[in-house]
């Protein structure tokens, strides 16, 4: 699926970072770049926590769901898209152990993770996969560019 | 400076109990801030007691062992407290608060708390 | 329960050695896994979390890998201050969110 290449959840780490129009790492959501974030994926990333004080934490959140709801509704992957924050907020386990007997993504749709922990990981997932997304487009939009001068 | 501090820690009775709190200073929970306890008995490994979801929505998540006998409660905007009841010597160890790493997808403490020490004997 | 086996314990080291420390999971959890250096006397400090990626304020020769039931943490070029014992941590799901911590690996530098 589009876009989709590279991200694995939980944890899901981005292949390539995501880069504004002039060139340079994206701010987080409120504004604030979480540190490392404009470093290479190849290098070690010195991200630090994205703390900030409650009421601009919650503006992001709001923002996130938000953007979830808009890319679920506009990216073709969409269901793709569900399934996968579905398997983030599951922790990837198949089934797990003990009394896991049903798939964690047909639970998450029925319903069950509802606790607050499920949703910051849905939303952590959503962020990061947005983040990919972003730093894809811009740099296809490079490589037109590039060969763009090099045809003139 | 933010830091966390513990207290309430000391000499207990067997099958007593004991309160434990933590206090954040230089910041208050906000929104995804899981705080969570860890015990560490003495020369052995870290043990994780359970977490809290201390800036929105109360919810809370225990080791399977400290169910019932454990409860972690948020007290205030900087406080959160730890119960223990039906205490033994098994339960002698340093006993940590940490918060959660904002950011991180896993459940990993980028915050801890010095330690407060619990002895359960006669 | 998912259970977190290390190995090797204590692994000894020279001064700009590499040391590697295993991690097992006892079921898949995914990149959910953190990494630890405790000190006598002092609380854990986060050193790699969601399995690879570096916490703030962490020198560079600290690196985690792995996913799934099989992680690894290496420290490159050694010095005396990594004498420390390194615990790792993974998060999981069973029917209902819990973390749990390896036994530790105590690493010994020469």
């Known amino acids: 699926s589009p876009a989709a290449a590279g991200l694995r959840f939980p944890g899901i780490r981005p292949e390539e970072e995501a880069y504004g129009e002039d060139g340079n790492p994206l701010p987080d959501f409120d504004g604030s770049e979480p540190p490392g974030a404009g470093s290479p994926a190849s290098a070690p990333r010195a991200a630090a926590a994205w703390y900030r004080p409650a009421g601009r934490r919650d503006v992001a959140h709001g923002i996130l769901n938000e953007a979830y709801r808009k890319v679920l509704d506009q990216l073709s992957a969409g269901k793709h898209l569900q399934s996968l924050v579905a398997r983030g907020v599951g922790g990837s386990l198949g089934g797990g152990a003990g009394d896991d007997a049903e798939p964690l993504s047909k639970r998450h749709s029925d319903g069950i993770f509802t606790d607050s922990y499920s949703r910051y990981r849905k939303q952590m997932a959503v962020k990061k996969y947005l983040a990919a997304v972003l730093g894809k487009r811009y740099k296809q939009r490079v490589k037109n560019k590039g060969r763009r001068i090099a045809y003139l | 400076q933010e830091q966390l501090v513990e207290s309430g820690g000391g000499l207990v009775q067997p099958e007593g109990s004991l309160t434990l709190t933590c206090t954040a200073s230089g910041f208050s929970f906000s929104s995804s801030d899981y705080m969570c306890w860890v015990r560490q008995a003495p020369g052995k490994g870290l043990e994780w007691i359970g977490c809290?979801?201390?800036?929105?929505?109360?919810?809370t998540y225990f080791a399977s062992w400290a169910k019932g006998r454990f409860t972690i409660s948020k007290t205030s905007s900087t406080t959160v407290t730890l119960q223990m009841t039906s205490l033994t010597a098994a339960d002698t160890a340093t006993y940590f608060c940490a918060r959660h790493l904002y950011g991180s997808i896993t459940f990993a403490f980028g915050l801890w708390g010095q330690g407060t020490l619990v002895t359960v004997s006669s | 329960a998912a259970v977190l086996t290390q190995t090797p314990s204590p692994v000894s080291a020279a001064v700009g050695g590499t040391v590697t420390i295993n991690c097992q999971a006892s079921?898949?959890?995914?990149?959910?896994l953190a990494w630890y250096q405790q000190k006598p006397g002092q609380p854990p400090k986060l050193l790699i979390y969601?399995?690879?990626t570096l916490a703030s304020g962490v020198p560079s020769r600290f690196s985690g890998s792995g996913s799934g039931t099989q992680f690894t943490l290496t420290i490159s070029g050694v010095q005396c201050d990594d004498a420390a014992t390194y615990y790792c941590?993974?998060?999981?799901?069973?029917?209902?969110?819990?973390?749990?911590f390896g036994g530790g690996t105590e690493v010994v530098v020469k």
């Open positions: 941590q993974g998060t999981y799901y069973s029917s209902g969110w819990y973390t749990a």
């Open positions: 079921q898949s959890i995914g990149s959910d």
């Open positions: 809290i979801d201390a800036g929105s929505s109360g919810d």
């Open positions: 969601d399995a690879s």
